[in-house]
């Protein structure tokens, strides 16, 4: 039995996968910040985790996925105010009793040092210095991501 948050996460991910493929993103859109091969949008307004997930989806993006500690640190360096928390795309899966990214993969326990409990209705936020488990209903800011497409030189056959 999936929780409502798990179901929402899966539904949104599936609907994103169904959408027609779009041309690759070569530059970050206005108001988005580039971090290596990603574009990040740090929200100004606040929302519970579910609404944040949905908002990123409508922006043709996803809640932030963090690959490793190095990416976490670089992302945290972009946060200007140490008191502000941002949702990322990681929440507790009750059925699998583990932290699960919205792309379906599980958290490698070495990647993030989470402060707080791993329990039902817990979602992960990051600040300038830490990673926290929060009630998913808490209204805080969030980070959306879009992947930049690497530029490859096209080879055209002789005409």
């Amino acid at each position: 039995q999936k929780s409502s948050i798990e179901k929402c996460s899966v539904d949104i991910q599936q609907s994103r996968n169904k959408t027609t493929e779009r041309p690759g993103l070569l530059n970050c859109p206005i108001y988005w910040q580039q971090l290596r091969e990603k574009c990040l949008l740090f929200s100004h307004t606040v929302n519970p985790w579910n609404n944040s997930l949905a908002d990123c989806s409508t922006k043709e993006s996803s809640l932030l996925l963090i690959r490793d500690k190095d990416e976490l640190i670089h992302t945290q360096n972009l946060i200007r105010d140490k008191a502000i928390l941002f949702w990322i795309g990681l929440n507790f899966s009750l059925s699998e009793k583990n932290w699960k990214w919205i792309n379906g993969s599980f958290l490698n326990s070495n990647d993030l040092e989470i402060r707080g409990d791993a329990k039902e209705n817990s979602c992960i936020s990051i600040s300038q210095t830490s990673v926290y488990s929060e009630y998913c209903s808490t209204e805080i800011r969030w980070i959306c991501q879009k992947e930049l497409t690497p530029v490859r030189n096209k080879v055209y056959p002789d005409s």
Partner: antibody, heavy 117, light 110 residues
């Protein structure tokens, strides 16, 4: 270039509902939030509220009980309904793009709505 | 009454600098770096001049600059020109996803 166009009745009777629609052209509706702002003649601006294209919204607390906003992404339109209007609701109503929920970078030209019997 | 306080009028001669203030509280201007400024000519829609306290959208002359100290934000127009004569409104994000405006300042170029 993003363009916004407000449309709706210019005259509404007291106690009735004011209804306006904003049509977005020249850009995506899905990547942004969208706000309504009004300005009584000779006075300052007042933020009415915003709608997210996910459907959720935020309203000015002073107007919240009377405001409803909706969005139709397929038509690239968003709408405002303000119920139980009085003469104090007479104003120029603007729609605006609200990219991050904290400022307005594109505005419609505004439409005057008069509340009078 | 507006949530943010602006002087009703300001003036300066061509080439001079003029600064317009916008005072709020710790729940709006003081609490967030999300102050914006708008220019409005008579009968026209407002135009974004400054956002996030000091950022200028493309197309806005660098004569326009913004700053903030505590609960007060400021817009400075340097090298004043005749076309700068307009009403100027400040705005700020406020607690729990609200936006508030100032009452507006009429800038006159003498």
């Amino acid at each position: 270039q993003v363009q916004l166009q407000e449309s709706g009745p210019g005259l509404v009777k007291p106690s009735e509902t004011l209804s306006l629609t904003c049509t977005v052209s020249g850009g995506s509706i899905s990547n942004y939030y969208w706000s309504w702002i009004r300005q009584p003649a000779g006075k300052g601006l007042e933020w009415i509220g915003r709608i997210y294209t996910s459907g959720s919204n935020n309203y000015n607390p002073s107007l919240k009980s009377r405001v409803t906003m909706s969005v139709d992404t397929s038509k690239k339109q968003f709408s405002l309904k303000l119920s139980s209007v009085t003469a104090a609701d007479t104003a120029v109503y603007y729609c605006a793009r609200d990219p991050l929920g904290t400022f307005f970078d594109y505005w419609g030209q505004g439409t005057l709505v008069t509340v009078s019997s | 009454q507006s949530a943010l306080t602006q002087p009703p009028s300001a003036s300066g001669s061509p080439g001079q600098s003029v600064t317009i203030s916008c005072t709020g509280t710790s729940s709006d201007v003081g609490g967030y770096n999300y102050v914006s400024w708008y220019q409005q000519h008579p009968g026209k829609a407002p135009k974004l001049m400054i956002y996030e306290v000091s950022k200028r959208p493309s197309g806005v002359p660098d004569r326009f600059s913004g700053s903030k100290s505590g609960n007060t934000a400021s817009l400075t127009v340097s090298g004043l020109q005749a076309e700068d004569e307009a009403d100027y409104y400040c705005s700020s994000y406020a607690d729990t996803n609200n936006v508030v405006f100032g009452g507006g300042t009429k800038l006159t170029v003498l």
